[in-house]
């Protein structure tokens, strides 16, 4: 099955933005939203944001989770608000992957 081709005038979605690329903004606008988790020296760093251009997120969003990084992508306004990327687990839940700043 072929990849879906981006439309000539692609729809832009509002996404939650949390992380190093967000500056002082808490949202961004793009063709895809994402929620990611990376392990930095054993510490869980969660980020959320958007891919402004379809191609930008195309490869990233298709990358399967690894022990050190995971990305989940979606399309829709604020669709990444309640998404928390999860590392692959060996058949059990892993509390250490919940978002660091969610109560």
């Amino acid at each position: 099955m072929e990849d879906e081709k981006p439309k000539v005038n692609p729809k832009l979605y509002m996404c939650v933005c949390e992380g190093l690329s967000c500056g002082n903004e808490d949202h961004c606008e793009g063709q895809q939203c994402f929620s990611s988790l990376s392990i930095n020296d054993g510490f869980h760093v969660y980020q959320k944001g958007c891919f402004q251009v379809y191609e930008q997120g195309k490869m990233t969003c298709k990358t399967p989770p690894s022990p050190g990084q995971a990305v989940e992508c979606c399309q829709g306004d604020w669709c990444n608000r309640n998404i928390t990327a999860q590392l692959p687990t060996k058949g059990k839940s892993f509390p250490g992957t919940q978002n660091f700043h969610l109560e």
Epitope: E18, G19, L20, C22, I39, N40, D41, G42, F43, H44, V45, Q47, P67, G68, K90, K92, S93, F94, P95, G96, Q98, N99, F100, H101, L102, E103
Partner: antibody, heavy 118, light 106 residues
């Protein structure tokens, strides 16, 4: 109640070895990353090492890389720090720590003192 | 590695004073910053995580703020038990602590 109890500290000569242990209780040990942090006498805190849930991924500060090895035994709820080629500058209180599901370094043990001196 | 610079390195204050400690990162760390309190001979105790979230059981006189490179820990009304050393800690990349700020009795 979460408890972390370090042991294994003591006096060792430069170039010597020591193995620290951290016995954990009060939580499902195998679900959590674990950490070692140290503090030289009268100085600040320094992150030393981290280990993931199954022990397959380990991380080290540059100052200890190649000399220290972190490991864990989930059946014993214990994390270890094997310290080789010890130097005077490794003299410190070594703390074991863990994160809660959403908060890094939320819990710490009481620490164990390692003194490297001839 | 990211450098964390705390200021001041020490300060003298009285009970009831408002105390502010700052931490500056050498590069953007977003909100990936914690604050710890340490008393002599004791392990550090977590006060604030993710820059501004109060750890359970910590009195509300403690608060944190900041994002990017500049962060602040504020004690709104200093209590006798607050005299201690305070450390910031970033986990954005190459985890590092600030050098500490000792809060002493004036």
């Amino acid at each position: 109640e979460v408890q972390l109890v370090e042991s294994g500290g003591g006096l060792v000569q430069p170039g010597g070895s020591l193995r620290l242990s951290c016995a954990a209780s009060g939580f499902t040990f195998s679900n959590y990353y674990m950490y070692w942090i140290r503090q030289a006498p009268g100085k600040g805190l320094e992150w030393v090492s981290s280990i993931n849930t199954d022990g397959g991924s380990t991380y080290y500060a540059d100052s200890v890389k190649g000399r220290f090895t972190i490991s864990r035994d989930n059946s014993k709820n214990t994390v270890y720090l094997q310290m080789n080629s010890l130097r005077a500058e490794d003299t410190a209180v070594y703390y074991c720590a863990k994160s809660t599901p959403n908060i890094p370094l939320a819990y710490w043990g009481q620490g164990t003192l390692v003194t490297v001196s001839s | 590695d990211i450098q964390m610079t705390q200021s001041p390195s020490s300060l003298s204050a009285s009970v009831g004073d408002r105390v502010t400690i700052t931490c500056k990162a050498s590069q953007n760390i977003y909100k990936y910053l914690n604050w710890f309190q340490q008393k002599p001979g004791k392990a550090p105790k977590l006060l604030i995580y993710y820059s501004n979230s109060l750890q359970t059981g910590v009195p509300s006189r403690f608060s944190g703020s900041g994002s990017g490179t500049d962060f602040t820990l504020t004690i709104s009304s200093l209590q006798p038990e607050d005299f201690a050393t305070y450390y910031c800690f970033q986990y954005s990349s190459g985890p590092t602590f600030g050098q500490g700020t000792k809060v002493e009795i004036k």
